[in-house]
C-alpha cells in the first residue's frame, strides 16, 4: 500500500521576514519520528501519531521544505514550496540633469533594490501621472530605463518611479512604491549672441544707456544676465516679455577706464551661455576754456585771449588754430571801443577712434570807454511845428553806459530823449544834451527851432 | 546482515582536512537517516549531525556547523564526513550510525574512524 | 538543547548485585535510548523507547522512567555488565547523549 506524507500550507505565499506554521501529516500507521528538511529556522510545535507541527521563523526567501518519515520499511516525503514576497528596500529614480535642452533627448533612469518575487514585480517610469514605460524588474538591482525627448511642457515636471509588486493572484493585493519625485528643468537657449546696444564713445564721468537683449529664451525668467564695461559689472534691470529677454543698465565711465574698452553682455542659461561684446572707447574731453586776461579793459589796454582744452585737443580761437593738439591758441589786442562786447570763439576738436567731436566756447570782451554821443543818430538842428507831436532821437553809448539828458540853456528845461513828446512854441531854443558816465561828459548843442502854427 | 564499515585511521597536520567514508550494506542506502558521532579518548559521545541519503538533507549541531560536512553517495550507498581546519581538539574516535528508527535508534554502529591531529 | 545528566558517573558492583543509573533530563522528553560500550568497541543500542530491550540483550536488564527522569536497572550483577552505559534523546535537534556511567566490577 502507498502511504502518502502531506505537507500543509501547500506552496503558501508569506512576507518576508513572517512566520509559517508547517504540518506534516502520513497515514501510515506508524510512530516514526516525522523530520522536517529545511534550512529555515524551525521549531517543533507539537508531535502525535503520523503527525508533526513545526513553526518556520523569519523566513526571508522562497524555500522548499520537505517532510520525511520512516514507513514500513522505506522512507516516503512530502514537500511544498514557500513563495516570500518582499516589497523593494529602495526604489530610487536617478538625478536628472540640471538642465535639459528642449529638444533633446534625456534617460529616466530608475533603480530597484530587493523585491520579490521578482516575476511579480514591474517598474512603471511616470511624468505627473503620465506612464511613460513599464517594464519586469529582472536583474539584482533592477535598472530600467526610459528614453524621454524633452519638451517645453516638461519644465518643472515630477518624474517619478513606482514600483508594482503583484501578488493579486495570490490574494494578497497590489503593493506599490513610490519614489520621491525629482523635477525636471527643460530650456531653450537660441545660438544666435544677444543684441548689444551701446555707445562707441563714452566721455569720463558721464553715463550713458547699455541694452542687452535675447529672443527665443525659455524659461526667460530664469535666465542671468552679466553686464560689465569692461571689469566692471554694470547693475542692470532685467525684465522677461515671452521669450524675450531684456537687460538695461546705464554705464558710467571712470577716469581711470580711459581707452579701449569692451562692454559685455553675458545670457547664462542651463549652464550654457550666449555672449555679445561691442569695443566702446572712454575718452576724456576737457574744455574748451576761453580766458581773457582781463575779463574788463581799459581802452587802449593790451588783452590776451587764450583758449585751451585736454590733451589732444585741437583747439581754434576765432579762426586762428593752436600750433599743435594739446597746446593753447593764444591772440592780442589793443583794447578799443569797438571791441566792447566782442565775443571771441574757440572751438575744440578731439579725434576718438577715428571720429571728430567738437566742442565750442566763448567769452564776451568788456572794454571800458568815456561816453560819446553819436551825431550821426542826433541831428543838431531840429526844426518842428507848434503844437505837434516829436520824438528827440539822440543816443549816447559809452561803458559804463552814460545817463543822456538834454537841457534847455539858461534854464533848467529838459526835453525827454528817446520819448515821444508834444512840441510848442515854448521849447524853441538851444540846448546842452550831456552824456555822462563815471568816466566822463560828453556834450552835444541841439537847436529847436518852433515854427508857430497858422492862426484861424 | 547490516553492515556499517568505516575508512581507516588518520594522521593530518594541523590545519589540514580529512575525509573519511562509511560504506552501508545489507539494506536500502536511502531509506535510513545516517548519523555520526564523535568520542574524543576517555570521553563520552558527541553528536555531529545526521544526513538524509535520499533527499541529501543535512542537519548539524551548531558546535560542527563550520567543522563538518556530510554528504552521501546513492550510487555506492556510501556516507562521507569531511572534518576542516583541524586542530588537536579534533582528534577523536568518528563513529556513523545508522538511525534504524523510533523502535531502533541508533541502531547500526560503524568501528569507527580514528582521527590523530599531529605536527 | 535538551541536557541528560547520567548519575553516577563511575560505579561498582559485585556480581548478583542490584545496578541502578539514572538520566535526568533538562526538559522533558517522550522516550530515551540507552546503549552499552565496552572499551575498544562502538557502542551497541541496549535499551530503546525508554523500556524496550535491543535484540540479544539479557532479560535482567530493564528500563523506565518519563517526563524527565529515567533510569536503567540491572536486577543481578554479571561480569559481562561492566561497561559504559549512555542515554540518548532526540526530542530536538541537537540529538544529545549524557556523559556516561561507568559500571565496573567489585
Known amino acids: 500500500q502507498e502511504f502518502l506524507l502531506r505537507v500543509e500550507p501547500q506552496n503558501p505565499v508569506l512576507s518576508a521576514g513572517g512566520s509559517l506554521f508547517v504540518n506534516c501529516s502520513t497515514d501510515c500507521p506508524s510512530s516514526e519520528k516525522i523530520a522536517l528538511e529545511t534550512s529555515l529556522s524551525k521549531e517543533l510545535v507539537a508531535s502525535g501519531m503520523g503527525w508533526a507541527a513545526f513553526n518556520l521563523s523569519n523566513v526571508t526567501g522562497n524555500s522548499r521544505i520537505l517532510c520525511s518519515v520512516y514507513c514500513n520499511g522505506s522512507q516516503i516525503t512530502g514537500s511544498s514550496n514557500i513563495t516570500v514576497y518582499r516589497l523593494p528596500e529602495r526604489v530610487e529614480l536617478a538625478p536628472l540633469p540640471p538642465w535639459q535642452p528642449v529638444g533633446q533627448n534625456f534617460t529616466l533612469r530608475c533603480q530597484v533594490e530587493d523585491g520579490s518575487p521578482r516575476t511579480s514585480l514591474t517598474v512603471v517610469l511616470l511624468r505627473w501621472e503620465e506612464e511613460l514605460s513599464r517594464q519586469p524588474a529582472v536583474e539584482e538591482p533592477a535598472e530600467v530605463t526610459a528614453t524621454v525627448l524633452a519638451s517645453r511642457d516638461d519644465h518643472g515636471a515630477p518624474f517619478s518611479c513606482r514600483t508594482e509588486l503583484d501578488m493579486q493572484p495570490q490574494g494578497l493585493g497590489l503593493f506599490v512604491n513610490t519614489s520621491a519625485p525629482r523635477q525636471l528643468r527643460t530650456f531653450v537657449l537660441p545660438v544666435t549672441p544677444p543684441r548689444l546696444v551701446a555707445p562707441r564713445f563714452l566721455e569720463v564721468e558721464t553715463s550713458w544707456p547699455v541694452d542687452c537683449t535675447l529672443d527665443g529664451l525659455f524659461p526667460a525668467s530664469e535666465a542671468q544676465v552679466y553686464l560689465a564695461l569692461g571689469d566692471q559689472m554694470l547693475n542692470a534691470t532685467v525684465m522677461n516679455h515671452g521669450d524675450t529677454l531684456t537687460a538695461t543698465a546705464t554705464a558710467t565711465a571712470r577716469a581711470d577706464q580711459e581707452g579701449a574698452r569692451e562692454i559685455v553682455c553675458n545670457v547664462t542659461l542651463g549652464g550654457e551661455r550666449r555672449e555679445a561684446r561691442e569695443n566702446l572707447t572712454v575718452f576724456s574731453f576737457l574744455g574748451p576754456i576761453v580766458n581773457l586776461s582781463e575779463p574788463t579793459a581799459h581802452e587802449g589796454s593790451t588783452v590776451t585771449v587764450s583758449c585751451m582744452a585736454g590733451a589732444r585737443v585741437q583747439v581754434t580761437l576765432d579762426g586762428v588754430p593752436a600750433a599743435a593738439p594739446g597746446q593753447p591758441a593764444q591772440l592780442q589786442l589793443n583794447a578799443t571801443e569797438s571791441d566792447d562786447g566782442r565775443s571771441f570763439f574757440c572751438s575744440a576738436t578731439l579725434e576718438v577712434d577715428g571720429e571728430f567731436l567738437h566742442r565750442n566756447s566763448s567769452v564776451q570782451l568788456r572794454v571800458l570807454y568815456g561816453p560819446k554821443i553819436d551825431r550821426a543818430t542826433c541831428p543838431q538842428h531840429l526844426k518842428w511845428k507848434d503844437k505837434t507831436r516829436h520824438v528827440l532821437q539822440c543816443q549816447a553809448r559809452g561803458n559804463p553806459y552814460p545817463e543822456l539828458r538834454c537841457l534847455k540853456e539858461g534854464s533848467s528845461r529838459e526835453v525827454p530823449v528817446g520819448i515821444p513828446f508834444f512840441v510848442n512854441v515854448t521849447h524853441n531854443g538851444t540846448y546842452q544834451c550831456q552824456a555822462s558816465s563815471s568816466r566822463g561828459k560828453y556834450t552835444l548843442v541841439v537847436v529847436m527851432d518852433i515854427e508857430a502854427g497858422s492862426s484861424h | 546482515q547490516v553492515q556499517l564499515q568505516q575508512s581507516g585511521a588518520e594522521l593530518a597536520d594541523p590545519g589540514a582536512s580529512v575525509k573519511m567514508s562509511c560504506k552501508a550494506s545489507g539494506y536500502t542506502f536511502t531509506v535510513y537517516w545516517m548519523h555520526w558521532v564523535k568520542q574524543r579518548p576517555g570521553q563520552g559521545l558527541e553528536w555531529i549531525g545526521y544526513?538524509?541519503?535520499?533527499?541529501?538533507?543535512?542537519e548539524y549541531n551548531q558546535r560542527f556547523q563550520d567543522k563538518a560536512t556530510l554528504t552521501a553517495d546513492k550510487s555506492s550507498s556510501t556516507a562521507y564526513m569531511q572534518l576542516s581546519s583541524l586542530t588537536s581538539e579534533d582528534s577523536a574516535v568518528y563513529y556513523c550510525?545508522?538511525?534504524?528508527?523510533?523502535?531502533?535508534?541508533?541502531?547500526?554502529w560503524g568501528q569507527g574512524t580514528s582521527v590523530t591531529v599531529s605536527s | 538543547q535538551i541536557v541528560l545528566t547520567q548519575s553516577p558517573a563511575l560505579m561498582s558492583a559485585s556480581p548478583g548485585e542490584k545496578v541502578t543509573m539514572t538520566c535526568s533530563a533538562s526538559?522533558?522528553?517522550?522516550?530515551i535510548y540507552w546503549y552499552q560500550q565496552k572499551p575498544r568497541s562502538s557502542p551497541k543500542p541496549w535499551i530503546y523507547?525508554?523500556?524496550n530491550l535491543a535484540s540479544g540483550v539479557p532479560a535482567r536488564f530493564s528500563g523506565s522512567g518519563s517526563g524527565a527522569s529515567y533510569s536503567l536497572t540491572i536486577s543481578i550483577m554479571e561480569a559481562e555488565d561492566a561497561a559504559t552505559y549512555y542515554c540518548q534523546q532526540w526530542k530536538s535537534i541537537p540529538l544529545t547523549f549524557g556523559a556516561g556511567t561507568k559500571l565496573e566490577l567489585k
Open positions: 526538559s522533558s522528553v517522550s522516550y
Open positions: 550510525a545508522r538511525w534504524g528508527g523510533n523502535s531502533y535508534g541508533l541502531d547500526y
Open positions: 523507547l525508554t523500556s
Open positions: 544526513i538524509n541519503p535520499n533527499t541529501d538533507y543535512t
